[in-house]
Every structure is written in C-alpha cells, then in structure tokens.
C-alpha cells in the first residue's frame, strides 16, 4: 500500500512540477525592472525568454518577440535549451510512469517491468527538474551579474548635465516558478525511485528445493511470495490519491491605496 | 463618441475644499485611467495626479500630497477631484483628461474654472 | 522631476511656412525595453482644452494633419508643422510621459507673421 501510495504521489508531484516548467518557460517576467528606488513608474519592462515586453501605466502593454536566433546571447540559448530539454524529458517521463502505476493493469505486465518503468520516469523527472533548476539558476545569475554592472554605471551622460537612468532588471515571477517546479519534478523523480525499490519483486541468487513430506507433495520456492499491497484482483481497497493541485488567480497587490511620486 | 463633461466653475475662500467633477461617456469607464490637470491664469499646464476607475487606484503629484483626494464612481461614470486647503495659487482652470497609450491624454474635459479668494 | 524645456517662448511664421519648436528634457525619456520614447505634444487654442498631436515622439494621433510631426529621440525632441495654417495658432507643450510626476514644458506660442 505504502509503494502504491509512494509512487501515486511521486507521480502527482512530478505532473504538478512539470506544468510548472512548462508555465515558467512560457512565462514573460523572467526578469523584472527594477523598482528598488521607484516603487511607482510609469513605463515597466520586463522579459522572458520569448519576448520582451512593456507595459505602461496607462494600462496599454506592448511585447516583442525575439525575432532573430543567432543575435541572442549564448547565455539565453542556453537557458532556452535547458528548460525545453526538461519540458521533454518530463514529458516523456509522464507517458511512462502513467503505465508503470500499480493501480493501472495493462494486460498482463509483470511487476517487474513496472518497477523499470517507475524507475526510467523517476530518472528522467530528477533530470527533468535539474534541467530547469540549472536553466532558472543560469538566468539568475546572468541577471546578477547585470544587475551589479549596471548599477556600477546606473549614471551616464554629458558632465553629469544630462542623466539617462540605465534599467536595471532584476528577479522575475518565472525564476521563482521555475525553481519551485524544478524541486517538485525532483522531489516527485526521488519519490519514483523509492517506489520502484518497492514494486520490485526481491530474487535470491538460490535455486528453489523441493520438500518431500511424506503422504503429500508440495513444493516451496523461496522468493515467490510478493508483499501484500490490497491492489491486484481486489479491487475494492482501489484508493484515488488527489494531489490537490489548484490554480490560484493572480492577484494584483498595490503597495499602498495611494501612490504619491 | 468620447466625451468628458465637468462641473461648473467654483469660488473658494483659502483653507476650503474644492470638489471638482468629470461625467464621462462613450467608452469603457472602468478601463481607462483617467488624470487631473490644471492651468494657472495665463501659465503652463501642471499634472495633479490620476485614478484609476476600475479598482480606485490613484497615483498623486507629490507637490499636492496630503491635499488631493482623486475619487470614482462606476455608476455614473463620474470621477471627483478635491483638492482641500485652498490658496490663492490653487485658482487655476482644472482639466480631467482620458489616459492612453504613450502614457499620453487623448480626450479632455472642457475645464472648470476655481477661483480662491478672500 | 524630469524637467522640460521649451525653445523658443514663441514664434511668428507666415502662413504656408515651416515652424519648428525645441523641447529638451533634463532626462532621457528613451525607454530601452521598447525603444520608445515617451514625450507627447500637445496643441492648445485660447479658451480650449489641449490637444493631443503626437505621442511617441513621432507617432501621430489619429485625425491630426501631417503636417504635424515629431522627431528626436533621448532628451532633444522637435515638433514641426511644415506649413503652416491659419488655424494653427495655439500655444504648443511637450510633455515628459516616462517619469512620474508628468511633467510639461513652459509651453511655445504660434502666431502668424
């Protein structure tokens, strides 16, 4: 039951994790304007890895695709790469890992063929979430380093008559997105692993005996009996384990009811 | 079409509030900003602030804090200005005008004239 | 603030001619994310509200004649009328639409020689 319940959450886990990827890579706000020393402005910029956008106050926003590939700094292929090769691989581990649950029979699969498949999704989640911790954490630090440049030159112009105020961008919602899915893909991957440490029947390296009781004839094997789990051809002890997943609405929070600048 | 029609003119002693209002029609109401100018006899055009009708969110000149108060009501699609504390420098014509793309004012109400005096 | 100023205070052209008014702002009003620039004219006529001419610094409002454009980019703009009309007379701002407060210039008077 503990297995069952092992990989059913592993597997919850990972599909939350995984559309968190997929979320985050499609997301704008990778990074942010900095509002540090103007909490209040009137133009807002703010990128992703597909598009760069501005929104103004008065409401009307504005995005632009990244139109060109070969004009893009290596850094953002990278992160663009990494976050696609996670969305893949999670995928691909999902398809697998739906046939690999216990509480699914398809013909008459052995265990354990179920416990190689439980164990290949959970690989391909942990790699999946490294992918998009590794992808978000790239583009963090890209954002770091800009951000520290930027702000060693927040101030240019002509003999300090004229300023022209840098944008400097800092952390966006996606980066945070990103790293939480990243850990629930990884965390589901683990939760697989332990799961196929459990459906797999134990063998031993020893040839089954025949006892020879006198009147009767029965023959034992060790290693053929599997733990009870209360699936199988009993269906009635069949438990649904919801991972509660649930959207929230973003909610647009204002600093205070009334901005003066 | 888009329209903004504004309440007639005020006289004010100093130390008074002023309650200035802007009747829009012709468009979505609660989706626009709408901003607050005004224009001192024969000089320059100052920006007081904005509201935003659709959730009550303004933003205010620092110059008016404490003084301005920017207000909306969605079922008349009316937007109040009051500014309290009156001086003499405050008689100025007051403008409501609708905020677009650009950040810029397209359409603006015909003004209302307040006057401060003693 | 973004300070914005205007050149010349007015100007007398004659009719059928090119008019041009300076706005400089104290800072750039380029934004990087889009490369726009933020800087809107308006047109006012005595006893009337003003008019929206351009935003954008170059993009002209719908309705306006083109005759009527905008150039500039950073902190130097210019509004011209590339000939001029009689019903052109008004005094004309530029305005700082990237940085709270708005700001406006001192304004530019048009008349007619």
């Known amino acids: 039951m503990a297995v069952t319940a092992c990989q059913g959450l592993g597997f919850v886990v990972s599909l939350i994790g995984i559309a968190g990827i997929i979320a985050a890579t499609c997301m704008d706000q990778w990074s942010t304007q900095d509002l540090y020393n103007n909490p209040v402005t009137a133009v807002f910029n703010y990128q992703g890895l597909w598009r760069s956008c501005v929104r103004e106050s008065s409401g009307f926003t504005e995005c632009r695709g990244y139109f060109t590939l070969l004009g893009l700094p290596a850094m953002l292929q990278a992160v663009r790469a990494l976050m696609i090769v996670g969305i893949v691989l999670g995928a691909i581990g999902l398809l697998v890992s739906i046939f690999a649950l216990k509480c699914i029979r398809i013909g008459s699969m052995e265990d354990s063929a179920k416990a190689n498949m439980t164990l290949t999704s959970g690989i391909m989640f942990i790699v999946s979430g490294l992918c998009a911790i590794a992808g978000v954490s790239v583009f963090a630090n890209m954002l770091v380093t800009n951000f520290w440049m930027s702000t060693a030159n927040m101030y240019t112009g002509m003999g300090g008559m004229v300023q022209t105020v840098q944008t400097r961008y800092t952390f966006g919602a996606a980066l945070f997105v990103g790293w939480v899915a990243g850990g629930l893909t990884l965390i589901g991957g683990v939760m697989m692993c332990i799961a196929c440490r459990g459906l797999a029947p134990e063998e031993t390296n020893y040839k089954a005996v025949s006892y020879h009781a006198s009147g009767h004839s029965v023959a034992y094997k060790p290693g053929g009996f599997k733990a009870s789990t209360g699936f199988g051809s009993n269906t009635k002890n069949k438990k649904i384990y919801d991972g509660g997943a649930r959207t929230e609405d973003e909610v647009q929070s204002y600093p205070s009811k009334h901005d003066y600048v | 079409q888009v329209q903004l029609v504004q309440s007639g003119a005020e006289v004010k002693k100093p130390g008074a509030s002023v309650k200035v209002s802007c009747k829009a029609s012709g468009y979505a109401f609660s989706s626009y900003w709408m901003n607050w100018v005004r224009q001192a006899p024969g000089q320059g055009l100052e920006w007081i602030g904005q509201?935003?009708?659709?959730?009550?969110?303004?933003t205010y000149n620092g110059k008016f804090k404490g003084r301005v108060t920017m207000t909306a009501d969605k079922s008349t699609s009316t937007v109040y200005m009051e500014l309290s504390s009156l001086r003499s420098e405050d008689t100025a014509v007051y403008f409501c005008?609708?905020?677009?793309?650009?950040?810029?004012?397209?359409?603006w109400g015909q003004g209302t004239l307040v006057t401060v005096s003693s | 603030d973004i300070v914005m100023t205007q050149s010349p205070d007015s100007l007398a052209v004659s009719l059928g001619e090119r008019a041009t008014i300076s706005c400089k702002s104290s800072?750039?009003?380029?934004?990087?994310?889009?490369?726009?620039?933020?800087l809107t004219w308006y047109q006012q006529k005595p006893g009337q509200p003003p008019k929206m001419l351009i935003y954008?610094?170059?993009t002209r409002e719908s309705g306006v004649p083109d005759r009527f454009s905008g150039s500039g980019s950073g902190i130097d703009f210019t509004l011209t009328i590339s000939s001029v009309q009689a019903e052109d007379v008004a005094v004309y701002y530029c305005?700082?639409?990237?940085?709270?407060?708005?700001?406006f210039g001192q304004g530019t008077k048009l008349e007619i020689k």
């Open positions: 509201i935003y009708p659709g959730n009550g969110d303004t």
């Open positions: 005008a609708r905020f677009v793309k650009g950040n810029a004012m397209d359409y």
């Open positions: 305005q700082n639409a990237y940085s709270y407060p708005f700001t």
């Open positions: 954008w610094a170059s």
């Open positions: 800072q750039s009003l380029l934004n990087s994310g889009n490369q726009k620039n933020y």
